[in-house]
């Protein structure tokens, strides 16, 4: 391991489709990858009126926007589909929502994931 | 082993649309995004978009912005890439590559657009 | 965003080494370590040699080395061997916040 670098083994692994994908509900998800490669974890979720529903957890893939990340944060104003990915174990069982706005000021909306 | 494998030849008109897909295995499908990228006949690489394959977030190049639609079906681990208004200059192979790094490729699909 | 700039092509003998450069700006190429270098044979699908400006990718010979000074990245084969000849290309990191450009691609013949 890198010093001052936090490698990621295992993320919160969700997916609110799991009977039509066939897969876990809930659980740990063990992260391969090229043994070179950095690993992730990352959380997908939906803010239907107010309403957090999250779609999916789990690893995810050697990515620079992840890079050195502890907390999992989407900056991205009002998307779709909320994501964000982080570094080090489990870092995806919280998220937050950090939108980066170009003239005011940004608004925090700290979530915490409870799983239906 | 990780595998992504795309559509056939296809052979359009002028005007028209294709639709190309890559088939992902091997791997979990949404883990990753999806790129495509062109080689014209003779010509070098040209990146047209990706596709985030768990958030269905996509990013284009400009020059293709509103002539190309990237998707991705997760249910079947399938991507997809919609070129409309084709062109004779559209005529390429076409290929899909997994993650940022395009660390695996598929055997590209043939796009031929004739009048 | 603009293609990067490769030569049009190099070329060397069975064992000499060469060098391929790739100049983007300080924007892309200069800010972050995030160029990669692609081998494509003919009638191929390009093949990804060297990922961050200077990671070997799994399997690849140690032969072939990345590396960057300012805003040119460059790789280097040393050793040449016949079934080094190839179109090589330069490109950048793909998703999220980033998008893709790729070098116009440099031919390398093995004389």
């Known amino acids: 391991a890198i010093l001052g670098r936090s490698e990621t083994q295992e993320c919160l692994f969700f997916n609110a489709n799991w009977e039509k994908d066939r897969t876990n509900q809930t659980g740990v998800e063990p992260c391969y990858g090229d043994k070179d490669k950095r690993r992730h974890c990352f959380a997908t979720w939906k803010n239907i009126s107010g309403s957090i529903e999250i779609v999916k957890q789990g690893c995810w893939l050697d990515d620079i926007n992840c890079y050195d990340r502890t907390d999992c944060v989407e900056k991205k104003d009002s998307p779709e589909v909320y994501f964000c990915c982080c570094e080090g174990n489990m870092c995806n069982e919280k998220f937050s929502y950090f939108p980066e706005m170009e003239v005011t000021q940004p608004t925090s909306n700290p979530v915490t994931p409870k799983p239906p | 082993q990780v595998q992504l494998v795309q559509s056939g030849a296809e052979v359009k008109k002028p005007g028209s649309s294709v639709k190309v897909s890559c088939k992902a295995s091997?791997?979990?499908?949404?883990?990753?995004?999806i790129n495509w990228v062109r080689q014209a006949p003779g010509q070098g690489l040209e990146w047209m978009g990706t596709?985030?394959?768990?958030?269905?977030?996509?990013s284009y190049a400009q020059k293709f912005q509103g002539r190309v639609t990237i998707t991705a079906d997760t249910s079947t681990s399938t991507a997809y890439m919609e070129l409309s208004s084709l062109r004779s200059e559209d005529t390429a192979v076409y290929y899909c590559?997994?993650?940022?790094?395009?660390?695996?490729w598929g055997q590209g699909t043939l796009v031929t657009v004739s009048s | 965003q603009s293609a990067l700039t490769q030569p049009r092509s190099v070329s060397g003998s069975p064992g000499q080494s060469v060098t391929i450069s790739c100049t983007g700006t300080?924007?892309?190429?200069?800010?972050?370590?995030?160029v990669n270098w692609y081998q494509q044979h003919p009638g191929k699908a390009p093949k990804l040699m060297i990922y961050?400006?200077?990671k070997r990718e799994s399997g690849v010979p140690d032969r072939f080395s990345g590396s960057k000074s300012g805003n040119t990245a460059s790789l280097t084969i040393s050793g040449l061997q016949a079934e080094d000849e190839a179109d090589y290309y330069c490109?950048?990191?793909?998703?999220?916040?980033?998008?893709?450009?790729f070098g116009g691609g440099t031919k390398l013949t093995v004389l």
């Open positions: 590559a997994r993650g940022g790094w395009f660390d695996y």
């Open positions: 091997g791997y979990t499908f949404t883990s990753s995004y």
């Open positions: 596709i985030n394959a768990v958030s269905g977030s996509t």
């Open positions: 300080s924007s892309d190429v200069g800010s972050r370590n995030y």
């Open positions: 961050g400006v200077s």
């Open positions: 490109g950048t990191f793909a998703g999220g916040d980033y998008y893709g450009v």
